[in-house]
Structures are given as C-alpha cells and as structure tokens.
Interface confidence: medium
C-alpha cells in the first residue's frame, strides 16, 4: 500500500491533522524535498549576518555577513572580521601571502605578482605582500641611445574574488 | 545547497572492519578540514580525528590512534574513516563535520554502526 | 586533555521562562574556541554559539553565550518549545577537542 504522504510535493508537508492532505509550507518554513510530514523553519539572516537568498517554499535562506566581516565555515554559519591586506583566509585563519603574491583587499586570495618580463618590461617598482610590482620601461627604453622613456604602466586592476 | 552525505548504516560482526564515507558537495572540499566524531547510544560526542583534504595532514585522539584511519579522495569530494577491530563498544552513529582552524561547523547526517555477532 | 563538565544533565523548563546552562572546563580555554552545538533526537548536531558569545546563523536572539576562563554559559531568555534539545559546550584550545557531556533540557 502506497503512502499517501509520497505524494506530497517539495514546498508542502502532509497534514495528518487532515488526512494526510498535502498543505503548503505556513509562512517562513519550507520542505526542500517531496513526502515530508513537516516543514523545516527558515534559517533566518540577523546581526552580524545578512541574507543573500531568501527563503522560499521549497528552499533555505541563505546568509553571508556584514561588510567588514566573512564567512567561516560551509553554508557561513559563522562571521568573522576580514583580514588585513597582504593576507588571505585560509581554513587556518588569516595568512601572510606567500613571498611572490600579494592582496590590496581584506578579502580575497593572494594572487602573483605580475610578471613585467613577460611584456618585455622591467621592475619599477618592487611588489609587497601589499601591492603588486610596478612595471617600469623595457630594458632597450632604458639605454644610454634612447630617445624617449616609455610611462610605467599602470598596476593590473585587481581581481575580485569570491570567498 | 551545502551538504555532506554520510554512507548507509552498517551491521558488523565483532573483529571485522568497516568503512564510512562523507562526500561534500556545495563546496571544495579541500577548504575545510573534515573531522569525524562518534556518538554512542545515549551518549555524547567523541572526537576521533580530522583530515586536512588539501595535504593530508591527520591528527587523531589518542584513543582512537591505532583504531581509525582518515583517507580522502579530492577528485571525489569525498572523506573516509576507515575502523578496525569492531567490539560491542564501537557501535555509534558517527558523524563527519567540516571545520576551519577553531570550530566544527557542518555536520553530515550521521552514520550508524551496529557491532554484533 | 580538557574535561568539560556540563551542568545540569538534564532540566525542565516553562515556557516563557529564563533558562541557564553551565559549562565547566578542567582548565582554562580561550573563549573563541569555546562553542555550543544544539542537537535533537534523530538530528545531527548544529552549531549554535560559536566562540563563545556568537549566534550562529539562523539561531534566534533569544538565545546568549558568556563565559571566559574555565567558566561558561548558554542562556534561553524565554524558554519556547523548539528550544527542547540536548546542548553540548565543546573546546578546540587544545588537542586533542573535547565535548561536554550535554545538558538536556526538557519542557515542564
């Protein structure tokens, strides 16, 4: 014999204060799967956390944090303060970047530094943990003949990356 | 959506081994360590180790050091807890948990482990 | 390794009434790696307070943490039915982590 509660499709909970008719989810709950005798309370997003995907009938909130903080943990059930600049998060808590990478942001990896010989330039302006390098002229722009020096070119625009 | 999935429960004869698996989805599970904690029945929580998936650093408590190996498959997103020689008191649900450097945060549903002959 | 007593095992309480749990440890542990986990019959274990005052996300703001030291408490300040629950106070300081024995709490 088949259970009637099978029936019930994601987004509702068989009732069996009403023989076990499939009633909606009551307002902030859900069911994300079908045949549920209840529906679970929406997680809600307070504080230090904010929400990022509301809840619906059939699916969770979803939470991340506050600027100037974030998430720790799968499904970021904790907030945390960034780290500094010329760090990154990593599962062991805020890192230095490793010698050759670098991070402008409080957030985000650590990514290398750019590598000016590869445009034919040189090192104008060495990188940090902070910063990355500043390309200067080629070396040929630099010789004691030439007629013009060539302006650094800009810092590539950093990356943003998600958490 | 963030999950671990436990393996099905297992019944086991006493001096046989048995192994769990956790696989991860939602996320990489080289980002977090994986811990496996157990729970006897009407009991509390015990930790056994944890395993950083991303180099395969292991840390075991002493009691369950030559009883419990940690493994992962990265290319599967997947943890394992491998016990050896299951007496009566080895039966428990036990859970794997993802964690950063200070707290366990999500758990898989559990697995159930019954030792008997 | 670091003994967490919990106190009481188990207690009732009314609804709407204030409720605090105890958490003692054999020595001293930082408060951020000092946590709680709720867990009901048939469910995993979730995360609840995290270093040691800190909501996790979707726990309501009736619920606080305090303590520093070996000394630490959970508090309910209206006791509702969903409350009904194991509480584990657990620490990370130090290898290897420990969990307390869990105080149940129960509905008068």
């Known amino acids: 014999l088949q259970d009637p509660c099978s029936n019930c499709p994601a987004g509702t909970f068989c009732d069996n204060n009403r023989n076990q008719i499939c009633s909606p989810c009551p307002p902030n709950s859900f069911s994300s799967a079908g045949g549920q005798r209840t529906c679970d309370i929406c997680r809600q997003c307070k504080g230090v956390f904010r929400t990022r995907k509301e809840c619906s009938s059939t699916s969770n909130a979803e939470c991340d944090c506050t600027p100037g903080f974030h998430c720790l943990g799968a499904g970021c059930s904790m907030c945390e303060q960034d780290c500094k600049q010329g760090q990154e998060l990593t599962k062991k808590g805020c890192k230095d970047c490793c010698f050759g990478t670098f991070n402008d942001q409080k957030r985000g990896i650590c990514r290398p530094w750019t590598n000016c010989s590869l445009d034919g330039k040189s090192v104008l302006v060495n990188g940090t943990k902070e910063r990355d390098v500043v390309c200067g002229p080629s070396p040929a722009d630099l010789s004691p003949g030439a007629s013009s020096v060539t302006p650094p070119a800009p810092a590539r625009e950093p990356g943003h990356s998600p958490q | 959506e963030v999950q671990l999935q436990q393996s099905g429960a297992e019944l086991v004869r006493p001096g046989a081994s048995v192994k769990l698996s956790c696989t991860a989805s939602?996320?990489?599970?080289?980002?977090?360590?994986i811990h496996w904690v157990n729970q006897r029945p009407e009991q509390g929580l015990e930790w056994i180790g944890r395993i950083d998936p991303e180099d395969g650093d292991i840390a075991y408590a002493p009691k369950f050091q030559d009883k419990a190996t940690l493994t992962v498959d990265t290319s599967s997103n997947t943890a394992y807890l491998h016990i050896i020689g299951l007496t009566s008191e080895d039966t428990a649900v036990y859970y794997c948990?993802?964690?950063?450097?200070?707290?366990?945060?999500?758990w898989g549903q559990g697995t159930s482990v019954t030792v008997s002959s | 390794q670091i003994v967490l007593t919990q106190s009481p095992a188990i207690m009732s309480a009314s609804l709407g009434e204030r409720v605090t749990m105890t958490c003692t440890a054999s020595?001293?542990?930082?408060?951020?790696?000092l946590h709680w986990y709720q867990q009901k019959p048939g469910s995993s274990p979730k995360l609840w307070i995290y270093?040691?005052?800190n909501l996790a996300s979707g726990v309501p703001a009736r619920f606080s943490g305090s303590g520093s030291g070996t000394s630490y408490s959970l508090t309910i300040s209206s006791m509702e039915a969903e409350d009904a629950a194991t509480y584990y106070c657990?620490?990370?300081?130090?290898?290897?982590?420990?969990f307390g024995s869990g105080t149940k709490l129960e509905i008068k």
């Open positions: 939602g996320f990489n599970i080289k980002d977090y360590y």
């Open positions: 948990t993802t964690g950063n450097y200070y707290a366990m945060d999500f």
């Open positions: 270093s040691t005052s």
């Open positions: 657990h620490q990370y300081h130090r290898s290897p982590p420990t």
């Open positions: 020595s001293s542990v930082s408060s951020s790696y």
